[in-house]
């Protein structure tokens, strides 16, 4: 229904706290360099204005669209061109082009320092002094580093953060209470960020139809007892919510997500028997819980998929009559039978089925042609199954750090032109799949591994798009989203690459490495490993292991030495020489 004042409508629906949080996220995601104080001032002005519209919807400018109101605010910021360069040109455009322009200038890899967590005492002090400002800072810092973070979900993580601080700041040992809990939230939030970015990429590159197909598969796996009409309704609503968030319409997105959660909880009987626990929770927790609710029990009496989609004489007629609906029912029926498959795999199977019908339905005897389609799925299913087995075996053998290193070597060989920091970040993220997925029960491994890898590789593609350097990466990133992971997996050593010359300074280390946290030490060592591979792309695993073991031993020795500086300056050159010899 149309409202006289959109801003008043959203303020009323969301309430002041969520309204302010979402506006702060929106501004922080658009203008990623502005300080918290600058954004907080704008948020307060927008909120005050919203309140005047709530009081009188006919007041001046209250009928303007949210894009117009927010865009005007952003464009009024002083020194916009000095701070943001050509983004300022967006302000010469009219809506909706202006908003599109802002979206195009979102930076997936902004040059901001890593978000450092203050030490426990300091954190608790500033939290107690002003919890609202503290949480505002959190929203601002996360949103500007992750310009596509799913806004209502970020409010959920802020709420989690708040609860942890409230609990731990009352403890005697704040540090040991806070650290594991906040690490857990951070890990989940980072995964949420790459997953949402993947959804926005799907929407931006391939449109709503592609996202809706993803949603149908995912929802059918989770709610196998819901009928196709119900799944279609949920997928349509979910597509709208995600389109809004990806498009920067965060107030609408959060409002519609709340509506969807309400609908699901009111219609549990036709959706799933597993929703009640989620539905008992308050809004943010409820929506989060519903987004990762466990799969409902599959109906026991599902007929074989072949009956309707291979053996039926009407296949081509049904396909001709409504292609999208017929393919949608295929995806629904296949997905509800296979919670053990990844969404990416299910979409590849649906694509294969569509291609088969396109070819076979044009033949004189279609049934004879498409009769073998399910058998043709087998290699598509085996490939990711083998990937999971091979990688989980390797993870179990090497542990997370060793597994990351194995992936780093593999990916540096595939795309040695990619910058070392990007390769290290990608390998570290890809390597976490082991800890995240390989410990799960067998039937949950494949969906966990492949859908997580796809999201990480989407980030690799986004970073590579900014500065394309590898034809291998460009090739894999240009295809459809669901083909990316198999494409990357199939890449081998890039034969066109001219190895980097050996530079001693790349492998020269100083005593400051000894005081670094373990994570930073690992990154230093992994940086060296990537550089070694760039120098010798065809080095054997054995050669690389020798060098890395030597390197670890060198660090251990010098960091334990009484005179660390002397040890690094005398033993360092010896290490470099041994490395060169080992790789010769």
């Amino acid at each position: 229904e149309a409202h006289k004042s959109e801003i008043a409508h959203r303020y009323n629906d969301l309430g002041e706290q969520h309204f302010k949080g979402l506006v702060l996220i929106a501004f922080s995601q658009y203008l990623q360099k502005c300080s918290y104080d600058e954004h907080a001032k704008l948020v307060q002005e927008v909120t005050d204005f919203a309140k005047t519209c709530v009081a009188d919807e006919s007041a001046a400018n209250c009928d303007k669209s949210l894009h117009t109101l927010f865009g005007d605010k952003l464009c009024a910021i002083p020194n916009l061109r000095e701070n943001y360069g050509e983004l300022a040109d967006c302000c010469t455009k009219q809506e909706p082009e202006r908003n599109e322009c802002f979206l195009q200038h979102k930076d997936d890899n902004p040059s901001l320092p890593p978000f450092e967590r203050p030490e426990a005492e300091a954190m608790c002090t500033s939290f107690k002094e002003n919890p609202t400002t503290f949480m505002g800072h959190y929203l601002h810092e996360v949103a500007r580093r992750h310009p596509y973070f799913y806004a209502p979900e970020l409010l959920y993580y802020a709420e989690q953060y708040n609860e942890i601080l409230t609990q731990c700041c009352a403890e005697a040992d704040k540090e040991s209470c806070l650290t594991p809990k906040l690490d857990g939230v951070k890990e989940k939030a980072l995964v949420s960020s790459v997953r949402q970015r993947m959804k926005c990429s799907s929407m931006q590159k391939f449109g709503e139809r592609a996202f809706k197909a993803w949603a149908v598969a995912r929802l059918s796996q989770t709610f196998p007892n819901a009928d196709f009409a119900e799944i279609t309704k949920l997928a349509t609503d979910l597509t709208k919510v995600n389109k809004e968030c990806c498009h920067g319409d965060l107030l609408e997105c959060a409002d519609d997500r709340a509506e969807l959660a309400k609908y699901m909880c009111e219609n549990q009987a036709t959706i799933s028997s597993k929703l009640q626990t989620c539905c008992d929770k308050p809004l943010l927790k409820k929506a989060h819980c519903l987004s990762e609710v466990e799969h409902d029990t599959m109906p026991a009496d599902l007929p074989a998929i072949a009956a309707d989609f291979v053996e039926d004489q009407e296949v081509c007629k049904n396909y001709a009559e409504a292609k999208d609906v017929f393919l949608g029912t295929f995806l629904y029926e296949y997905s509800r039978r296979h919670p053990d498959y990844s969404v990416s795999l299910l979409l590849r199977l649906a694509k294969k089925y569509e291609a088969t019908l396109e070819k076979c339905c044009a033949e004189a005897n279609p049934p004879a042609c498409y009769g073998t389609v399910l058998a043709e799925f087998q290699p598509l299913v085996e490939e990711p199954k083998n990937l999971v087995k091979t990688n989980c075996d390797l993870y179990e053998k090497l542990g997370e750090y060793g597994f990351q290193n194995a992936i780093l070597v593999r990916y540096t060989q595939k795309a040695p032109q990619v910058s070392t920091p990007t390769l290290v970040e990608a390998a570290r993220n890809l390597g976490r799949v082991g800890t995240k997925c390989c410990t799960l029960p067998e039937d949950q491994r494949l969906p966990c591994v492949e859908d997580y890898l796809s999201a990480i590789l989407n980030r690799v593609c986004l970073l590579h798009e900014k500065t394309p350097v590898s034809e291998h990466v460009t090739k894999c990133c240009s295809g459809s989203l669901v083909e990316r992971r198999p494409c990357f997996s199939a890449l081998t050593v890039d034969e066109t690459y001219v190895p980097k010359e050996f530079k001693a300074e790349t492998f020269t280390f100083h005593s400051d490495i000894c005081t670094l946290p373990e994570k930073e030490k690992q990154i230093k060592k992994q940086t060296a490993l990537a550089e070694l591979v760039k120098h010798k792309p065809k080095a054997t695993a054995e050669q690389l292991k020798t060098v890395m073991d030597d390197f670890a031993q060198f660090l251990d020795t010098c960091c334990k030495a009484a005179d660390k500086d002397t040890c690094f300056s005398t033993e360092g050159p010896n290490l470099v020489t041994r490395c060169k010899d080992a790789l010769a």
């Epitope: 004489q313 007629k317 001709a320 004189a364 279609p366 049934p367």
Partner: nanobody, 115 residues
Framework: KVQLVESGGGLVQPGNSLRLSCAAS????????MSWVRQAPGKGPEWVSS????????LYADSVKGRFTISRDNSKNTLYLQMNSLRPEDTAVYYC????????SSQGTLVTVSS
């Protein structure tokens, strides 16, 4: 909405010819193989002939081979069945279908072969 409308049927004497047409709409005609199916009074449907989307490939039931010719004009979204040397046992309602379907989703056109 898919629509198939057959025409060209009628009463003919044995040995004579008829040409049936099927006008198609509501789908990408050239992307689909098409068939002619017939149903004699009191009997089940019987497949007669099929043609690929491009028209390059055709199939016939043994009972009509050498007498009937299936063809199509994709620019006109129309399927044809040229029936020569008609026999009394060819009497039936003829209807066109998409792909390998035998089920009837149109009125069909009645062909009666009788002296």
């Amino acid at each position: 909405k898919v629509q198939l409308v057959e025409s060209g049927g009628g009463l003919v004497q044995p040995g004579n010819s008829l040409r049936l047409s099927c006008a198609a709409s509501g789908f990408t005609f050239g992307s689909f193989g098409m068939s002619w199916v017939r149903q004699a009074p009191g009997k089940g449907p019987e497949w007669v002939s099929s043609i690929s989307g491009s028209g390059s490939d055709t199939l016939y039931a043994d009972s009509v081979k050498g007498r009937f010719t299936i063809s199509r004009d994709n620019s006109k979204n129309t399927l044809y069945l040229q029936m020569n040397s008609l026999r009394p046992e060819d009497t039936a309602v003829y209807y066109c279908t998409i792909g390998g379907s035998l089920s009837r989703s149109s009125q069909g056109t009645l062909v009666t072969v009788s002296s």
